[in-house]
């Protein structure tokens, strides 16, 4: 049968696409009869000899027989029987192994709609950018939650694209994480970098106590610091009881001796005793609050001739407790800048910083900050918070460490910092941030862009507002149209260009009288809301002779749809056959809701409009 | 091009000495520290020492500490290991290798092809 | 000293298969990790550093991931010269030390 390719008129708001249709079909057994399941639960793999090939069901296959299928039989099925067999398995509960998963995942190239009939375990080696919908990720990540993430290595490339996917999904911006949120994220909460342990330690520490495995170095470093805090949901640990320490239970081998010191040494001892006699607890975990490094504290006095006079390489091969007792914590802080040219191992940098945080317990004076050097990677956010930086000279030493790497919760936190100290984000200080991170522009919210100043625009480049949101734009464009108010036409425009993501309708209209020639990589990221007031004839202005390529966008946001919202007469003007406009006698109703639903307007065909039509002629007649 | 070609091995009875040499080539030596590996017959790889800037700076693996000294001729680009007091347990394949530029890695980027040390009566 | 584990000890694998071989360390060793590929008779070869870094000229399948004490060496696309033995190494702290090695052999 030959499918229709026409849009529907009557009845087009919200219709079910057809593939929705025949699925259900095939679910119910319309399109491949089903037959009664095998009730055998053998748990040994049958050989199976190309048994998936060509039985009359697969849902008739034994769990046993169907337990170690190899991947090389899967290779040769059709997506149909792949998606058959992986309900089948789903519905005798067989247990599949990462390799078998990861393959049946590899052949089923659409994104499956019936979730809920694959196995659940199967869903972390499908691609989560083909449920992008906030209905289809929604229902994949609620999915997820269930499902055994642990199965996957943290490393593995199939992990590491489910968390940054499921905050996308479940809408979080930025590191502030809700109770709601570590929920949505079950068993990927565990991968949550530092920086959302940092902002959001109240919901996420008592989650991370059941991570299974290490947590990693940033996110150690990031719980070490807000336990220290002393903040919610534990307090500071100088009043931590028994029931404190029992509730942190899978977090305590991140404890750093500053915080089992302030542990009050009667509940540490209460506790241990207690643990001792309890064999569920695991080993590890009991021997992080034992006297730590017996060996090491019994050498705490510096070796004769090894006192540190000066910071230079002879201190390269110093161990982790000669350092700690040989060099002094002042001789430190008045030679940080030698410290960048020593190779010292990153055990070592850790001593050292150490020592800086005991002397200086409020937070580091500008003049150490300046010298950090690579010392910077190894503060933590809270570190940084503690810092008053107001020199530009510092701030460029720092980012220098960087240079080369994504922006981390570090720098993000100096930025911050930084800014807040000169109180809006002058000129200077966005040539430099924008000259190591083209994107920093576009980490800010809203309200942080708000102040910056219309004078700072003009050190904005375009390659700086290429990850802005339409709502950062929204905040900048009227900053960027007050900046360069005083530009002639065609200068104007090459200036105001990449900020027009934010701009208005009339300011549009008023564009397209200029022939200006947009590209349409421009149109293209301009809003939609913007967009669907301009008439076929102002595009044409606007666009001048780049129009031509909306034959290629049609179907892409906002020219798709701009195009619904124009008569198909008009847009056969253009001669670039550009179809879905509205056909002559039909009525657009704009139906806000309704649109906001479905996505597309609803389109009432010749009967209805007649009907509108004598009811407003009567109406004005009477 | 970067290169390393070690000498200086051979049979040694158990408690004698023998001296290693290194000679680099093709980068500039005295920017980078320089280590001494070593692996046994059929055995994995051992750090057994390393030197920085001058040559004043020195690190061993306290299996030779005391017994193996590194240290280095930046004119004339050699990296060098006296070896005393010898055991069984020394014999080993012994590489030089440099230090990769990137910091903290302490990988070693460039090694030689090894020369063989067999301490036995 | 910091203790390295590798896993397995040996494995067996045809051209175009993906290999994966483990590293863990004693205590947690950040990033600082590096793989090295060794064959008979020759001086080991750095294939990846600080955990994820490819050497130049090192070919794209191989690739590095893990952090902390967990650390995995994924070749994705196995070929006649990768079979070899591999050896992780920390350079987080002196002295530094090398896995026991992973053998990989033509199945």
């Known amino acids: 049968m030959a499918l229709p390719t026409a849009r529907p008129l009557l009845g087009s708001c919200g219709t079910p696409a057809l593939g929705s249709l025949l699925f259900l079909l095939f679910s119910l057994g319309w399109v491949q009869p089903s037959r009664t399941l095998a009730g055998e639960t053998g748990q040994e793999a049958a050989p199976l000899d190309g048994v998936l090939a060509n039985p009359p069901n697969i849902s008739s296959l034994s769990p046993r027989q169907l337990l170690g299928f190899p991947c090389a039989e899967v290779s040769g099925l059709s997506t149909e029987r792949v998606r058959e067999l992986a309900v089948a398995l789903a519905q005798k509960n067989v247990k599949l192994s990462t390799e078998q998963l990861r393959c049946l995942a590899h052949r089923l190239s659409e994104p499956p709609e019936d979730l809920d009939a694959l196995p659940l375990d199967l869903l972390l080696f499908l691609n989560p950018d083909a449920f992008s919908g906030p209905q289809a990720c929604t229902r994949f990540f609620s999915r997820i939650t269930k499902a055994n993430v642990d199965l996957l290595p943290r490393g593995a490339p199939e992990r590491q694209r489910l968390l940054p996917a499921a905050l996308a999904c479940w809408g979080v911006r930025g590191s502030l994480l809700s109770e709601a949120d570590v929920r949505a994220l079950g068993g990927l909460a565990c991968d949550l970098p530092g920086r959302f342990v940092a902002e959001s330690a109240e919901v996420l520490l008592p989650r991370l106590v059941s991570c299974p495995g290490p947590l990693d170095q940033d996110q150690q470093e990031a719980a070490r610091a807000a336990l220290q805090g002393g903040g919610p949901p534990y307090g500071p640990p100088s009043t931590w009881s028994v029931s404190t320490m029992d509730a942190l239970r899978g977090l305590l081998p991140v404890l750093g001796q500053p915080i089992i010191r302030s542990i009050p040494q009667g509940i540490v001892a209460a506790w241990r005793q207690r643990s001792s006699r309890d064999p569920s607890w695991r080993q590890p975990e009991r021997t992080i609050l034992r006297p730590r490094f017996r060996r090491e504290v019994e050498k705490t006095a510096c070796p004769s001739g090894k006192k540190a006079r000066e910071i230079d390489e002879s201190l390269i091969f110093y161990k982790k407790w000669e350092l700690e007792a040989c060099v002094d914590a002042a001789l430190l802080a008045t030679q940080m800048d030698r410290v960048n040219a020593i190779p010292f191992t990153y055990e070592q940098l850790d001593v050292l910083k150490h020592k800086l945080d005991e002397l200086y317990p409020q937070g580091y004076p500008e003049s150490v900050i300046q010298h950090l050097g690579y010392l910077f990677l190894k503060m933590s956010p809270e570190d940084i918070r503690k810092w008053n930086v107001t020199s530009l000279e510092t701030l460029k030493a720092l980012l220098e460490v960087n240079k080369g790497h994504e922006m981390s919760p570090q720098v993000a936190t100096l930025i911050d910092r930084f800014v807040k100290g000169r109180g809006q984000l002058d000129k200077d200080t966005l040539d430099t941030l924008t000259a190591f991170y083209p994107g920093y522009l576009c980490s800010l919210s809203p309200e942080e862009l708000s102040s910056v100043p219309p004078s700072s625009i003009w050190a904005v480049r375009p390659q700086d507002l290429d990850t802005c949101d339409p709502r950062q734009l929204d905040v900048l464009y009227p900053k960027a149209r007050l900046a360069f108010q005083n530009m002639n036409g065609s200068e104007y425009f090459v200036k105001i260009q990449s900020f027009l993501g934010g701009a208005p309708t009339e300011d549009l209209k008023a564009l397209s009288q200029q022939n200006v020639s947009m590209d349409l990589a421009t149109f293209m990221k301009l809003r939609t809301d913007a967009v669907l007031p301009l008439t076929v004839a102002e595009v044409q202005k606007l666009l001048g002779p780049h129009v031509e390529g909306l034959k290629a966008e049609e179907r892409h946001r906002p020219v798709r749809d701009w195009i619904l919202r124009q008569r198909q007469d008009d847009l056969d003007t253009l001669g670039l056959g550009l179809q879905g406009g509205i056909p002559n006698g039909y009525l657009v109703l704009d139906l806000s809701m309704q649109e906001a639903l479905s996505g597309t307007p609803c389109l009432l065909g010749p009967g209805p409009v007649l009907t509108v039509l004598a009811l407003l002629l009567a109406s004005t007649l009477a | 091009e970067v290169q390393l070609v070690e000498s200086g091995g051979g049979l040694v009875q158990p408690g004698g000495s023998l001296r290693l040499s290194c000679a680099a080539s093709g980068f500039t030596f005295s920017d980078y520290g320089m280590h001494w590996v070593r692996q046994a017959p059929g055995k994995g790889l051992e750090w057994v020492s390393s030197?920085?800037?001058?040559?004043?700076?020195?690190g061993y693996a306290d299996s030779v500490k005391g017994r193996f000294t590194i240290s280095r001729d930046n004119s004339k680009n050699t990296l060098y290991l006296q070896m005393n007091s010898l055991r069984a347990e020394d014999t080993a394949v012994y590489y030089c290798?440099?230090?990769?530029?990137?910091?903290?890695?302490?990988?070693?980027?460039?090694w030689g092809q090894g020369t063989l040390v067999t301490v036995s009566s | 000293d910091i203790q390295m584990t590798q896993s397995p000890s040996s494995l067996s694998a045809s051209v175009g298969d993906r290999v994966t071989i483990t590293c863990r360390a004693s205590q947690s060793i950040s990033n600082w990790l590096n793989w090295y590929q060794q064959k008979p008779g020759k001086a080991p070869k750095l294939l990846i550093y600080a955990t994820s870094s490819l050497q130049s000229g090192v070919p794209s399948r191989f690739s590095g991931s893990g952090s902390g004490t967990d650390f995995t060496l994924t070749i994705s696309s196995l070929q006649p010269e990768d079979f070899a033995t591999y050896y992780c190494?920390?350079?987080?702290?002196?002295?530094?030390?090398f896995g026991q090695g992973t053998k990989v052999e033509i199945k």
């Open positions: 030197i920085y800037g001058s040559g004043g700076h020195t």
């Open positions: 190494q920390q350079s987080y702290s002196f002295p530094f030390t």
């Open positions: 290798a440099k230090q990769h530029a990137y910091r903290y890695s302490y990988a070693f980027d460039v």
